[in-house]
């Protein structure tokens, strides 16, 4: 018996088609993805093959103005239109709190939303009961398939799930649910979840009875053969893990941003064992037409976005200096504003010993593309911010050793004076450079804001200590020559859309007046 699994993950509000790098679509003839194009391909496969499941492994929320404006209603609407069969909760589904998950998505979705390792307690338990499930048994043809969900247990550090949701260890939580499915005579079981490729592989190895793992969170691209676009495969598709009980378990992920549709064919025997698995992600390029009815619906929903772009978010009473003459040479107040917003967006008081789990921000000056003039009545709009941060990136959470940070700051000024983009703007860091010294030895003082303290203060950076840092995904991926970050990072979790972070901060503060205050000397 053959099952076709179609899967997406980390779509991050790319409802409209995008450029090849998943930023805003400029030249439509070369654009990719989007729900209208996805629907065309899904329908084509549904017509051609008998047993098809369309699954999403989480993080539909967060990433473009679509989410900023519609707050998840767009996810429910278009996933319903595409007739998804199931979705796992990702960490970003909690970005607007539990209410921001319940009302727009959980109550509106016509498909099961799953996570076995999230347990509700207190008053939330009855409110959320039945709105998400640990597993769901789906009829497919004359067979049944069990889908069991999981979510990164790091979610409390990455999003805003509140205090009434407990995130358990994935493997510990999954095993009893899989065992329950087995007692219900469900012998074909897919683990669908959002904890990253390493955890996906561990689940395949450790959870007895899981036949296939469909994952997300790490934006992992897997491919067998010659890849069709710019993404470099982390391994073959599917990635085969040998379980502790001697089975071959296929593990898949489909990169991110709706650029690909994962396509996996699984052959099951009478006992529900996987006899064979093969497939590849399908690149959703312009050779696949956009479905006209979905496209018309997108255009209808689009109208509200255009209106939103020009509405006032808040005011500035100072010039926001985002000029390259400032931000690529010295501390600039636009850099300070953005870093302050980045830290503010990551306030999570999850431990009494820590005032916050992260205090530090770095930001490449070259990523700041425009100033904002305060002489327009001080008004700041989304449109203004899109000029400052036009690349559609995210502000991510990484863990780095002190020694890596030191290398990063040396790189920041290794060719100082040439107006290059690698000059770092900071938050929660005091750095002193001596530019008379030779490149690679110019950082003379590097103090960082403590986290394990009730009164935050600056202490010297320790080379062997592990620090959490908020930074643009561009830097986490080694951009602007920060190869040491990419090579040496100990953990990387993707965060919220850059503009959204700054926009939310400005809306929260109402009036802003960032200063140049001696963070960089």
């Amino acid at each position: 018996w053959e099952l076709t699994i179609l899967h997406t993950n980390d779509v991050h509000s790319r409802l409209e088609q995008t450029s090849e790098d998943s930023s805003k679509c400029v030249n439509a003839s070369r654009c990719m993805g989007g729900v209208a194009r996805l629907f065309t391909k899904v329908q084509q496969i549904r017509r051609a093959e008998p047993n098809v499941l369309l699954l999403d492994a989480g993080d539909q929320y967060q990433g473009t103005i679509w989410f900023t404006v519609y707050k998840g209603a767009e996810v429910a609407h278009f996933m319903n239109a595409l007739r998804y069969d199931a979705m796992a909760l990702g960490n970003h589904e909690f970005d607007n709190g539990v209410e921001g998950l319940i009302e727009p998505l959980l109550k509106e979705a016509k498909f099961p939303i799953l996570s076995a390792n999230i347990k509700a307690k207190g008053p939330l338990a009855s409110q959320i009961s039945g709105l998400y499930l640990p597993y769901k048994v789906l009829p497919v043809g004359d067979e049944v398939v069990g889908i069991v969900g999981y979510t990164s247990k790091e979610t409390p550090f990455l999003s805003n799930p509140g205090t009434n949701l407990v995130f358990e260890d994935e493997i510990t939580a999954l095993q009893p649910e899989v065992d329950k499915l087995k007692t219900l005579n469900v012998n074909k079981i897919i683990a669908l979840g959002h904890s990253g490729f390493e955890m996906d592989k561990l689940i395949a190895q450790k959870v007895r009875g899981v036949d296939v793992v469909v994952g997300g969170h790490s934006n992992t691209f897997l491919y067998t053969g010659n890849p069709p676009s710019k993404e470099v495969p982390a391994g073959k598709y599917p990635f085969i893990v040998t379980s502790d009980d001697g089975r071959k378990v296929p593990v898949v992920q489909a990169y991110a941003f709706g650029k690909y549709l994962g396509y996996l064919k699984i052959e099951f025997d009478e006992r529900g064992n996987v006899i064979s698995s093969h497939g590849n992600p399908i690149l959703l390029n312009s050779s696949i037409p956009e479905d006209p009815s979905i496209k018309a619906d997108i255009n209808k929903w689009r109208i509200k976005l255009d209106n939103y772009s020009t509405q006032e978010l808040g005011k500035t009473i100072v010039y926001l200096d985002g000029s390259s003459q400032s931000c690529r040479f010295r501390e600039c107040n636009m850099g300070n504003l953005i870093c302050d917003a980045m830290i503010n967006n990551n306030l999570r008081h999850t431990d009494e010993m820590f005032w916050n789990h992260v205090s530090m921000c770095i930001l490449n000056g070259g990523g700041i593309r425009s100033p904002i003039d305060e002489r327009n009545n001080g008004t700041i709009t989304w449109e203004n911010l899109a000029a400052v941060l036009p690349f559609g990136g995210t502000f991510d959470l990484v863990q780095l050793k002190g020694s890596t940070l030191k290398k990063a700051f040396e790189h920041s000024v290794h060719r100082y004076g040439q107006s290059t983009g690698e000059f770092l703007q900071v938050g929660g860091i005091h750095v002193v450079y001596d530019l008379s010294r030779k490149p690679g030895d110019r950082v003379v003082k590097l103090d960082v804001l403590c986290t394990k303290c009730r009164v935050p203060s600056y202490d010297p950076l320790k080379m062997d200590e592990v620090y959490k840092v908020i930074l643009p995904n561009f830097l986490a991926n080694g951009g602007d020559g920060f190869q040491m970050i990419k090579d040496e990072l100990l953990r990387h979790d993707s965060g919220d859309q850059d503009i959204n972070v700054v926009s939310t901060y400005i809306s929260k503060m109402k009036v802003i007046y960032p200063a140049v205050e001696g963070r960089i000397k």
Epitope: N185, E270, S276
Partner: antibody, heavy 113, light 106 residues
């Protein structure tokens, strides 16, 4: 639980027709095929034929003229019919799942007058 | 038809011994190979499917490997209950079996 239960005669006279039934539980005949295999005493296993989930059948060329495999999906039953039995057809007959994950208990069929 | 050549046809071994049985296919069968165990009573049980995946409840001392036309069943430490006849079965085309390997007590 996935099981196959065989039924049918243990003794058949030469030239007669053998009819064996394989009753399936734990999976559906609309999703999976059933294979038939036999094993003469002291010898190896020999494939006879298969009926697929869609209802079509394939047969070992050596038996194609006298073998028929049919099924009743609603009853979860598969029937093997072999005509013109000969003493050389004496063997243990097995039904098995399409992929061999499950086997019937086997039926020793002796062809003798 | 795909022919399967299994060797040895029989072997004598002691408890604790490592036992290896091989099967050669007349053409590439792309990992579509099972290993079966038949005890003297006649009952047939699948041990390994898709070349190397272990069936539920089968001890980890059994392992399978191979690709293309060459396949191997290994019993890492023979136990008393392992004395039986073992068959390879290809299902890339119409089923064909190896001739069997009888594992006897030395």
């Amino acid at each position: 639980e996935v099981t196959l239960k065989q039924s049918g005669p243990g003794l058949v006279k030469p030239t007669e027709t053998l009819t064996l039934t394989c009753t399936v539980s734990g999976f559906s005949l609309s999703s999976y095929g059933i294979q038939w295999v036999r094993q003469p005493p002291g010898k190896g296993l020999e494939w006879l034929g298969v009926i697929w989930s869609g209802g079509s059948a394939d047969y070992n060329a050596a038996f194609i003229s006298r073998l028929t495999i049919s099924k009743d999906t609603s009853k979860s039953q598969v029937v093997l019919t072999m005509t013109n039995m000969d003493p050389v057809d004496t063997a243990t007959y097995y039904c098995a799942g399409q992929y061999g994950s499950v086997w019937g208990q086997g039926t020793l069929v002796t062809v003798s007058s | 038809d795909i022919q399967m050549t299994q060797s040895p046809s029989s072997l004598s071994a002691s408890v604790g011994d490592r036992v290896t049985i091989t099967c050669r296919a007349s053409q590439d069968i792309g990992d579509r190979l099972n290993w079966l165990q038949q005890k003297p009573g006649g009952a047939i049980k699948r041990l390994i499917y898709a070349t190397s995946s272990l069936d539920s409840g089968v001890p980890s001392r059994f392992s399978g490997s191979g690709s293309g036309t060459e396949y191997t069943l290994t019993i890492s430490s023979l136990q008393p209950e392992d004395f039986a006849t073992y068959y390879c079965l290809q299902y890339a085309g119409s089923w064909t079996f190896g001739g069997g390997t009888k594992v006897e007590i030395k």
